[in-house]
Amino acid sequence: AGVFELQIHSFGPGPGPGAPRSPCSARLPCRLFFRVCLKPGLSEEAAESPCALGAALSARGPVYTEQPGAPAPDLPLPDGLLQVPFRDAWPGTFSFIIETWREELGDQIGGPAWSLLARVAGRRRLAAGGPWARDIQRAGAWELRFSYRARCEPPAVGTACTRLCRPRSAPSRCGPGLRPCAPLEDECEAPLVCRAGCSPEHGFCEQPGECRCLEGWTGPLCTVPVSTSSCLSPRGPSSATTGCLVPGPGPCDGNPCANGGSCSETPRSFECTCPRGFYGLRCEVSGVTCADGPCFNGGLCVGGADPDSAYICHCPPGFQGSNCEKRVDRCSLQPCRNGGLCLDLGHALRCRCRAGFAGPRCEHDLDDCAGRACANGGTCVEGGGAHRCSCALGFGGRDCRERADPCAARPCAHGGRCYAHFSGLVCACAPGYMGARCEFPVHPDGASALPAAPPGLRPGDPQRYL
């Protein structure tokens, strides 16, 4: 267990041109406050996933009124640190979001109004117990300067706050197997405190508060022997000593989520989906109102009408969830028609359309033949978002611009020779065959299966295919 601490040093215009306008005015005095959200690991899921490590809200800063004509200075800040307690081990790598909020104190109907001025996010490595780390982040024309650290709460020590220290019981040495607690050399590392009730014979722990079972034992406290009866549907390795292994406790067993939160298993642990009005790793943080700035991603907070709707977040496009914490996968709704590719750009959806389709959602089937002439007497045929030319004899290619080789398909039968001709092809038939494609055998008595050849053409002469 421990505390992540954030100290805001300044919030004001960043360097360079385009200084932002002051967020407050004589007509609309305002004050700032900050919100920090922490998540374990170096995940990219900065804005939309829950603040699994915790979240905190600063006090309100002093009321500020802009001096007319003066550039926006560094704005007056709230006193004190933002502190995010963490109950479990410090993960070492974490993602953060720091939001700067403006509270307008003008004559609004219905009390003060909140708006998000800036949001910065980042991913960092940090060992607990180390010195303050300084950082500068920019959001648009604004610049935020801050420091942060993670410190363990006694008796925890170490870079992950997982080792426990106790004062020495004997002046000279620690107990068997226990080392001195650097840097607190006058204290000794304490044995891990497992989950209350964890069986000392059959359970052990590697983290405070857990209870892991030795082989052959199961249950949340490792007090239940694994069944040795024969298994109808084995769920794990079986051996002569343990028989069939029933699954050990899952991370959601006993539902670790408080206040009606629902638990879902994740690859490494569990995640609580909290009802409105609660948040935190186990939905343990309650009593949230709009004054706590519970809406993420620029969501607008309005007061709810009963304790189960303590506040309501009206989410901006692209976000959902009771705290606007989930990014909507808008492409999952398959908005692009006719096989278009969907791109979610965050601020907008784009559809990349297949050839022959257009429109914001690829809903328009283009007239494939419009403005597309087929050359050399070909005719255009529409189909499937693309156009095709049916070419006149002797021409080919996409637009009938290529002169076709009529002999390419070997149209003359029975060994006839093919000759390309300006109006088509001519077959010179082998002896004994006749017809436009040499398809008819000549009868042995000199007659043929066709009418007599026209005058001037003897059987065996080339027959022009008209």
Partner: antibody, heavy 117, light 109 residues
């Protein structure tokens, strides 16, 4: 538009029973706590009962005047709210409204319960 | 059991500003009471006006506003209209129990 339609009211004798129903449409019924509120003739409003949602284990709460006589329940699959009224008294005569609170209070049109000998 | 008290009757003129209040017997009304204001017109026609102390319902005219004034919840009608003549109830939540005030009969003369 959110709609709450109450049915089941009527004339009943003292110590009798009646079951009111409320059909809900156009919002995610499963998410919200639901309430029954009543108004006796010529009187003000009185909250009667409340049932929370599944994630709050369908916890129920009652006004002292109806405790142990009335039972509030819900059927999330049908988006229905119910009020089972037993051992009715003359002072239970009122218009009964199905109500839920979100950003403000949403009301049904009511159903009249008359308890009379 | 908490008791919620409202003015029994108020009279105002068209165009005037009038404030109805809602007091709790348990102490100051806070945002944790999620003050709700409901309008009743003849024939049992109820309309939710304000939820969560100051959240005006969609379609409710901007002249209606909710707030906390001192230790009470308040409904202010800025520039009352004749059609605002009605009975106004406030409801306060105490954990999971809702308590209504007796209602204020507003007359707009």
């Amino acid at each position: 538009e959110v709609q709450l339609v109450e049915t089941g009211g009527g004339l009943v004798q003292p110590k009798g029973s009646l079951k009111l129903s409320c059909a809900v449409s156009a919002f995610t019924f499963t998410t919200y706590a639901m309430n029954w509120v009543r108004q006796a003739p010529g009187k003000g409003l009185e909250w009667v009962a409340r049932i929370r949602n599944k994630s709050n284990n369908y916890a129920t709460y009652y006004a002292d005047s109806v405790k142990d006589r009335f039972t509030i329940s819900r059927d999330d699959s049908q988006s229905m709210l119910y009020l089972q009224m037993n051992n009715l008294k003359i002072e239970d005569t009122a218009m009964y409204y199905c109500v839920f609170h979100y950003d403000y209070v949403y009301w049904g049109q009511g159903t009249l319960v008359t308890v009379s000998a | 059991q908490a008791v919620v008290t409202q003015e029994s009757a108020l009279t105002t003129s068209p165009g005037e500003t009038v404030t109805l209040t809602c007091r709790s017997s348990t102490g100051a009304v806070t945002t944790s009471n999620y003050a709700n204001w409901i309008q009743e017109k003849p024939d049992h026609l109820f309309t939710g006006l304000i939820g969560g102390t100051n959240n005006r319902a969609p379609g409710v005219p901007a002249r209606f506003s909710g707030s906390l004034i001192g230790d009470k919840a308040a409904l202010t009608i800025t520039g009352a209209q004749t059609e605002d003549e009605a009975i106004y109830f406030c409801g306060l939540w105490y954990s999971n129990h809702l308590v209504f005030g007796g209602g204020t009969k507003l007359t707009v003369l």
